[in-house]
């Protein structure tokens, strides 16, 4: 969370940004809020990126002004126009690229004053893992798969019964480069599992952490997965 203040004569407005992460190939949001102002025609929003000449996006007089937009962002940006009046200056970024990572500035001017705040935008790939029982193996095993990760993550297994146990000796993890030659498919197999136990497959890089849980009993298999972005908010 980054809060910036701006001074315009006697007036300053608070601008707040949130560090966030983009999943490459998907759409992302760079979050920025400011003190609301009902006078839409007096609101100017400018998004800038460190090291880039020209603007990422500009919104003024109630509409986009892309005359100074840098070509790397052409056709990829939009503000939430109906939300600007309530202080939402967040930027929607289409088809996030690895090169979109960096420091951005959200600059705001309203009839009340002006202000700005920076945000760090991280880019990478992250996806939910899916765990299945691998019945083809010679001994009962679990297969944890996640289709898209970058940078290369670490993978660890845990078990509810054997808490603190190190499963690295009884697991095998591989990373397979996807067709676009950036992201990788993660596959990890855990051998010698026992029934009536809950196992967790944890995949983590510097952007995200994902966990897949599986509980295998005689009668059923229960799965749960979750994903959280790191260093956000």
């Amino acid at each position: 969370l980054i809060i910036g203040f701006g001074i315009s004569g006697k007036h300053f407005i608070t601008v707040t940004t949130f560090t966030s992460a983009g999943n490459i190939g998907e759409d992302g949001t760079l979050s920025c809020t400011f003190e609301p102002d009902i006078k839409l025609n007096g609101i100017v929003i400018q998004w800038l990126k460190e090291g880039i000449k020209g603007l990422v996006h500009e919104f003024k007089e109630g509409k986009d002004d892309l005359s100074q937009q840098h070509e790397m962002f052409r056709g990829r940006t939009a503000v939430f126009a109906d939300q600007v009046v309530v202080g939402n200056a967040s930027l929607r970024l289409k088809n996030v690229q690895l090169t979109d990572a960096g420091t951005y500035t959200c600059y705001i001017r309203t009839s009340k004053g002006k202000g700005n705040a920076n945000l760090e935008y991280k880019t990478g790939a992250f996806s939910m893992p899916e765990i299945n029982v691998d019945y083809n193996a010679s001994s009962e095993s679990l297969r944890c798969e996640a289709p898209r990760w970058f940078p290369q993550p670490t993978v660890a297994w845990a078990s509810q019964v054997d808490q603190g146990a190190n499963f690295s000796e009884v697991s095998n993890t591989s990373f397979e480069l996807n067709s676009e030659n950036v992201t990788m498919k993660v596959v990890s197999v855990l051998y010698n599992v026992t029934i009536n136990n809950t196992y967790s497959c944890m995949i983590e890089n510097d952007i995200a952490k994902a966990t897949g849980d599986i509980k295998v009993t005689d009668s059923e298999v229960k799965r749960r997965s979750q994903l959280q972005l790191l260093n956000s908010g």
Partner: antibody, heavy 117, light 107 residues
């Protein structure tokens, strides 16, 4: 779902102050950023925006009514209020409260206020 | 203040007809134009916001277009429940102002 309900006297004497309250139910008035607004409609006529307030206390009034209007908010009661002073027969109207972003998406059902001695 | 002029002020149409209502702003309001439907004794109901975005729950026969100063509300196939008064409203510059309304009546 969010509902708005206007309340207040239906009859006000000329030169007195009209006071209305809008009670928000089904959600908190503070949960997000909205312009809590008042709009009126004289009998058989069109709609007129009176003004709006943010929970921060910032107010915005129609210049044609600004000298007579006060809008306030009470987050503890989940209510916002309208006061219109020095009323005349021209202030007779149905008064609506509404929630707004850059559009008025949730409205109360309206309350008729007649200004008469 | 920005003046909003609606036309026509009233029209008669039959069920199934395509109906078009126009709204003109006295200065550019970008796309900050909203459309409401009001039935007698009821509060207005939001139909279209941001000139062309359909409000959740509103039938797809309603559509909006335009930007700048000229805007249109279209009902592609008029239904019995659509007979009402329609208002445009700008939220670009306070005071927010409404058009005078268009009453859609049964022919």
């Amino acid at each position: 779902q969010l509902q708005l309900q206007e309340s207040g006297p239906g009859l006000v004497k000329p030169s007195e102050t009209l006071s209305l309250t809008c009670t928000v139910s089904g959600g908190s008035i503070s949960s997000s950023v909205y312009y809590w607004s008042w709009i009126r409609q004289p009998p058989g006529k069109g709609l007129e925006w009176i003004g709006s307030i943010l929970v921060s206390g910032s107010t915005y009034y129609n210049p044609s009514l600004k000298s007579r209007v006060t809008i306030s908010v009470d987050t503890s009661k989940n209510q916002f209020s309208l006061k219109l002073s020095s009323v005349t027969a021209a202030d007779t109207a149905v008064y609506y409260c509404a929630r707004a972003v850059s559009f008025l998406d949730v409205w109360g059902q309206g309350t008729m206020v007649i200004v008469s001695s | 203040d920005i003046q909003m002029t609606q036309s026509p002020s009233s029209l008669s149409a039959s069920v199934g007809d395509r109906v078009t209502i126009t709204c003109r702003a006295s200065q550019s309001i970008s796309s900050y134009l909203n459309w409401y439907q009001q039935k007698p004794g009821k509060a207005p109901k939001l139909l279209i916001y941001g000139a062309s975005s359909l409000q959740s729950g509103v039938p797809s026969r309603f559509s909006g277009s335009g930007s700048g100063t000229d805007f249109t509300l279209t009902i592609s196939s008029l239904q019995p429940e659509d007979f009402a008064t329609y208002y445009c409203q700008q939220s670009y510059d306070p005071p927010w102002t409404f058009g005078g309304g268009t009453k859609v009546e049964i022919k």
